[in-house]
């Protein structure tokens, strides 16, 4: 049994890091393998992650972490029984994929203005709470070409757009994702989408 693709890990910079790797053949990850991880710190203890299958030869493990700070470094040991298959390390702050925003809501009752709000996925005491920016994707269910992205570069988790920038009388969907420039993160997954019917009063044309 050998490792074909070494483990690569990403952290949500809160409580979970996810490591994925591939073996050189079909493997029952949960019965044959264990990933041991330990924070390099005087008071830390080793923890064991039981991997799950991710395709025939692929494995994935979700490492639970109390909290994360920028200097953290973890040792990783991948074992098959008594055999050490791979040894490595992982700095969560260098491989961050933020959590997806939640609770996306479209408020349509504000005088021909659409107000989209969502929740920051981090608690206020987490470093990323004040460092996230967002991308909002709005698209028409009727017209695949009607697809737009709004970049929200301020901290407030909201976006205002004029209803008239979208077509009236049709349904739209929106979703939002996050990233943090400070840690050069990847984008989060998209939030679940929300749907609304766009309607607004056309301005009265005078002749």
């Amino acid at each position: 049994m050998k490792v074909l693709q070494e483990p690569t890990c990403v952290s949500d910079y809160m409580s979970i890091s996810t490591c994925e790797w591939k073996m050189n053949g079909p493997t029952n990850c949960s019965t044959e393998l264990r990933l041991l991880y330990q924070l390099v710190f005087l008071l830390s203890e080793a923890h064991t992650c039981i991997p799950e299958n991710n395709g025939g030869a692929g494995c994935v493990c979700h490492l639970l972490m109390d909290d994360v700070v920028s200097a953290d470094n973890y040792t990783l040991d991948l074992w098959a029984g008594q055999q050490l298959l791979w040894k490595g390390s992982f700095k969560p702050s260098e491989h961050v994929k933020p959590r997806a925003p939640g609770n996306l809501t479209v408020h349509t009752n504000v005088s021909d203005t659409l107000l989209l709000t969502w929740s920051n996925p981090y608690p206020p005491d987490n470093y990323l709470y004040n460092h996230l920016t967002y991308a909002v994707n709005i698209w028409s269910e009727n017209d695949p070409a009607d697809f737009r992205i709004y970049n929200v570069t301020y901290l407030e988790p909201s976006l205002r757009i004029a209803a008239s920038t979208l077509k009236s009388g049709i349904s739209y969907r929106a979703r939002v994702r996050a990233w943090a420039q400070c840690y050069n993160t990847t984008w989060s997954e998209w939030s679940p989408s929300t749907k609304w019917h766009n309607s607004y009063r056309e301005p009265f044309e005078q002749h």
Epitope: F41, L42, L43, D66, V69, S70, A71, N73
Partner: antibody, heavy 120, light 106 residues
Framework: EVQLQESGPGLVKPSETLSLTCTVS?????????WNWIRQPPGKGLEWIGY???????SYNPSLKSRVTISVDTSKNQFSLKLSSVTAADTAVYYC?????????????WGQGTTVTVSS | DIQLTQSPSFLSASVGDRVTITCRAT?????MHWYQQKPGKAPKPWIY???NLASGVPSRFSGSGSGTEFTLTISSLQPEDFATYYC?????????FGQGTKLEIK
Amino acid sequence: EVQLQESGPGLVKPSETLSLTCTVSGYSISSDYAWNWIRQPPGKGLEWIGYISYSGSSSYNPSLKSRVTISVDTSKNQFSLKLSSVTAADTAVYYCARGGLRRRGLFDYWGQGTTVTVSS
Amino acid sequence: DIQLTQSPSFLSASVGDRVTITCRATSSVTYMHWYQQKPGKAPKPWIYATSNLASGVPSRFSGSGSGTEFTLTISSLQPEDFATYYCQQWSSIPLTFGQGTKLEIK
């Protein structure tokens, strides 16, 4: 809320053993964290003495190791410091404090301190 | 032992000033903490793991650094900030503190 309270004699004679107890309320010392003793001589800086962890393992400052014992009484939720063969140089305010894996060892809760004078 | 040296040891400054305190270590440190102490009181946790503010610490405080050099910065001094500040490392036994920086009103 977590609270720590030091207690023990304020005056110890040279060559005797200094004994202090830290009573913890609001948190079980056998649950987690390292439970530390730190001292501060008059007008000087802070010196770490040692800790005992929730699991019972201990670690001491090598400069004091031969004279120090830190023990725990989980039934009373207390941990104690014994420092033998004291001299005037051991005169200080003695603090107990909690430090753990979360926040990477930060001493997040401290006792108010108890003054110990070594004098005949 | 990892020795920590703070500079300056004494600092006179005025309300509104920007102030920086440096802590240098004789060996590389992973986790550096800072405490604030006022006369007759126990130290209070102030900044943990280099840059994270402890609970209740005002945002005018910040921490930075890595390896052997770390700093605590106050962007605009307030009257309640005059105190002694200590750095402390959790990278190796014995745990050690800096000698302290006493911040006084000019």
